[in-house]
Amino acid sequence: VCSRDFTPPTVKILQSSCDGGGHFPPTIQLLCLVSGYTPGTINITWLEDGQVMDVDLSTASTTQEGELASTQSELTLSQKHWLSDRTYTCQVTYQGHTFEDSTKKCADSNPRGVSAYLSRPSPFDLFIRKSPTITCLVVDLAPSKGTVNLTWSRASGKPVNHSTRKEEKQRNGTLTVTSTLPVGTRDWIEGETYQCRVTHPHLPRALMRSTTKTSGPRAAPEVYAFATPEWPGSRDKRTLACLIQNFMPEDISVQWLHNEVQLPDARHSTTQPRKTKGSGFFVFSRLEVTRAEWEQKDEFICRAVHEAASPSQTVQRAVSVNPGK
């Protein structure tokens, strides 16, 4: 219980806002407001899940209004820490008493905010078809009378090509809008930056997304192809696997060929590139083939298209269901 000769502080934590798309920025600021106390020595400590945090992460300032004082302390957190669901506490020691307030990331609410994504061209489109495109994808839009505008531009200020637009209503009632822009192969390879600007009456501000050729080290993919052995009960089907690894950057296209003809993408299943922690990226690709196919010609080719592969940006490996026959 506080004695009557001082007024205890009120402690309140405020949190920095999300960006226009409803996403958390790379860093989050927590502001601890300690207000309305009789001037005197005050000690502010930040806790993470009950543990004292590094004081270097926070800054504090005090002001006096009439007979009462206020102090504020700001804590900067990385997005990773904030999203990890830890609890952050501002603990105030004053006149031998402790006052505190705690906060943590709120549970995701429905519906989520609008998100925009901008893809890079696939290596297949860039190096084989030589007609690269980039796609601006806007998801989680609430269907409304307002029009979503997607505007393309280039950092160089040069004009952009004509884009194609598609709108799709999703099962959950939200709207997805995509705009696909053809880009020049040389422009892309030489490092041009493309921007997609998304505006909508219900968005507090425009969403801007940009994309350009990935910088950083280059490494060509290694390709290994395998056939699984015959499995009881499935004599007329066989699974082929392709491991593609140690490539950088992560952009890669994977194709399977039979009889010198590229098989439709729907025929195979390929993982997203994963990091190896030091050797580059890897993907696995899986293709199911039928007896009719391998009896016609028992050679299947797994091909990777990647900018660091030479010659002609492709590496491929052949695999047979029954090698040696």
Epitope: P26, T27, D56, T76, S78, K80, G216, M248, K275, K277
Partner: nanobody, 122 residues
């Protein structure tokens, strides 16, 4: 948007020194571990060094230990690599890099700068 811009590369004689800088913008630099990586012509890329957010924890590849020093100035949003006793085998493109998850050792980083070329030759 994360942006990294390296500078300080150039031609230096064996045994000489260079200091690379990396100016960061578009993110809270002081909240991210940072790294330097390099790639010699025709060779695989190599992680060189990493430093934690506060600059207290540093790691080095065996090939540069005792010769290179990584440091950072969070007030200036800048990462440095002091390279002493340079050898011809240090000739490479050097990039500063960071990652949303892990940048304190070898990795395929989320973000790289445009690179700066270091040539060690007499």
């Amino acid at each position: 948007e994360v942006q990294l811009l390296e500078s300080g590369g150039g031609l230096v004689q064996p045994g000489g020194s260079l200091r690379l800088s990396c100016a960061a913008s578009g993110f809270r630099f002081g909240n991210y571990d940072m790294a330097w990586v390099r790639q010699a012509p025709g060779k695989r890329y190599e992680w060189v060094s990493s430093i934690d957010t506060g600059g207290d924890i540093t790691h080095y590849a065996d090939s540069v230990k005792g010769r290179f020093t990584i440091s950072r100035d969070n007030a200036k949003n800048t990462l440095y690599l002091q390279m002493n006793s340079l050898r011809p085998e240090d000739t490479a493109e050097y990039w500063c890099a960071t990652d949303e998850e892990y940048a304190l050792g070898p990795n395929e980083f989320d973000y790289y700068g445009q690179g700066t070329l270091v040539t060690v030759s007499s």
